[in-house]
């Protein structure tokens, strides 16, 4: 049978650390981290770290009992947690029977937005108390709500990360631009800006609160040539206030009456957090 890992929390030092070991397994060959989206019972999503590691291919893995992974997170407050992953079998070969190094992974450390994490891993039994043991570490900075994984975090969803306003904007005449967009059930106040190098027009939009998505339309007076200008739609949802995710589109010429409105290929480009 091939070894697998069984992982569980281990907050204090590993018991092996207190024992003297004549020989210890070598260090890890590789350590990687990426955020992954996992579904939870409530139908919500949880973003966790997928920590994967590769074992060095030599006879020292015969001594390997476990690998310990510790994560320190630094944002508004500091967090620290460790897991110990025990190998279910002794290693009978230095590489997988199908070829390639032994590779394992653990999914479980929660990932917060825009946080710097320090991930360290070492093999057990590790070096003796007064010796420097081989270990591997890396830094991982979690992205914000615009990331394709992080956008599923509850805080991001409440800031409109999953909302696609499907913006269309067209120049009606030299003085006005018509902006259409799909509203969000998250809120009813929006700001639409038209800008080239500077802001050439804007309008506040307030729609009646609705639990469903509807199309809103606003005609915005502009002070300059608007064709090719950028439209920026900023929502003001109660959950994120002025820190909600902006969306962008481009102004095109309005079609002739009776011709279908052309979809703007640049619609709903993710913007960022408002400064």
């Amino acid at each position: 049978r091939e070894p697998t890992v069984q992982c569980g929390s281990e907050t204090g030092p590993s018991p092996e650390w207190m024992l003297q070991h004549d020989l210890t397994p070598g260090d890890l060959r590789d350590l990687r981290v990426e955020p992954v989206k996992t579904s939870v019972a409530t139908g919500d999503y949880s973003i966790l770290m997928n920590v994967s590691w590769v074992l060095r291919a030599d006879a020292s893995i015969r001594l390997l009992k476990a690998t310990k992974i510790c994560v320190t997170g630094k944002s508004n407050f500091q967090s620290y947690s460790c897991v110990r992953c025990n190998y279910t079998e002794a290693f009978q070969t230095q590489t997988r029977p199908s070829g390639g190094k032994w590779t394992f992974s653990y999914i479980g450390f929660p990932v917060e937005l825009n946080t710097v994490y320090f991930i360290g891993a070492h093999n057990i039994p590790n070096a003796n108390m007064n010796e420097d043991g081989p270990s591997m570490s890396l830094n991982f900075t979690s992205p914000g709500c615009l990331d394709h994984i992080m956008k599923y975090k509850k805080k991001c969803v409440k800031a409109g990360s999953l909302w696609d306003p499907n913006i269309t904007a067209c120049k009606k005449n030299e003085e006005t631009v018509e902006v259409n967009f799909t509203t969000s059930p998250l809120g009813n106040r929006y700001m639409a800006l038209i800008q080239h190098s500077t802001i050439i027009g804007f309008s506040q939009v307030s729609e009646p609160y609705q639990n469903k998505q509807t199309r809103a339309s606003v005609v915005i007076p502009v002070t300059e040539e608007s064709e090719g200008a950028m439209v920026q739609l900023t929502p003001y949802f109660p959950t994120c206030g002025s820190d909600c995710i902006r969306h962008k589109g481009t102004v095109v010429l309005c079609p002739q009456t009776g011709v279908p409105f052309p979809l703007d290929n640049n619609r709903s480009k993710p913007g960022g957090w408002l400064p």
Epitope: A57, D58, S60, R62, L63, T93, T95, G99, G100, K101
Partner: antibody
Framework: QVQLVQSGAEVKKPGASVKVSCKAS????????MNWVRQAPGQGLEWMGR????????QYNQKFKDRVTMTRDTSISTAYMELSRLRSDDTAVYYC???????????WGQGTLVTVSS | DIQMTQSPSSLSASVGDRVTITCRAS??????LAWYQQKPGKAPKLLLY???NLADGVPSRFSGSGSGTDYTLTISSLQPEDFATYYC?????????FGGGTKVEIK
């Protein structure tokens, strides 16, 4: 059955390079490390390094690190060892040897005699 | 690097003799040791690995023992085809090294 078949004998001048091939058959090439071991006339065995055909990871004996290059071509299940800047004391039989579960050498090629002479 | 010291470097023995070859590692190799037999003009042949495990097709008169740094290869009853040179090798992590060899000759 497992077979490792090496390229033929070579005569080289000092300063030249030699490339020895080792064609594997009878097993899944990417599943085991391939080692290179040399033996000078009347001398013992000397490990030069190893390559993992799965991902081309290489570990060299420091003694040869600057002069040896190990490669592989998985499409033809062949490993290669190139030794550059040859000297007369590189005259030896060069063997490829496949690792077992760990790095005991379960199968050996027939050997390739490389003679370095001016 | 781990040094492997083999002794004796050569020995003379007769058919039927019990022959013992020793191999000492410069540090603990945790029983990661193999023995090879080599005949003139031929590639080495694996005899034992992990100290005591016989490789495929190797006669049971060959046996191995030892742990830590000291290891022994024993041929219980020497046969004519056993006259050859024997090498030990550690595989406790690269670089792998061999003993200097023991030549077993006919007395």
């Amino acid at each position: 059955q497992v077979q490792l078949v090496q390229s033929g004998a070579e005569v080289k001048k000092p300063g030249a390079s030699v490339k020895v091939s080792c064609k594997a058959s009878g097993y899944t090439f990417i599943s085991y490390w391939m080692n290179w071991v040399r033996q000078a006339p009347g001398q013992g065995l000397e490990w030069m390094g190893r390559i993992d055909p799965y991902d081309s990871e290489i570990q060299y004996n420091q003694k040869f690190k600057d002069r040896v290059t190990m490669t592989r071509d998985t499409s033809i299940s062949t490993a290669y060892m190139e030794l550059s800047r040859l000297r007369s004391d590189d005259t030896a039989v060069y063997y490829c040897a496949r690792s077992g579960g760990f790095d005991w050498f379960a199968y050996w090629g027939q050997g390739t005699l490389v003679t370095v002479s001016s | 690097d781990i040094q492997m010291t083999q002794s004796p470097s050569s020995l003379s023995a007769s058919v039927g003799d019990r022959v013992t070859i020793t191999c000492r590692a410069s540090e603990n190799i945790n029983s990661n040791l193999a023995w090879y037999q080599q005949k003139p003009g031929k590639a080495p042949k694996l005899l034992l690995y992990d100290v005591t495990n016989l490789a495929d097709g190797v006669p049971s008169r060959f046996s191995g023992s030892g742990s830590g740094t000291d290891y022994t290869l024993t041929i219980s009853s020497l046969q004519p085809e056993d006259f050859a040179t024997y090498y030990c090798q550690h595989f406790w992590g690269p670089p792998y090294t061999f003993g200097g060899g023991t030549k077993v000759e006919i007395k």
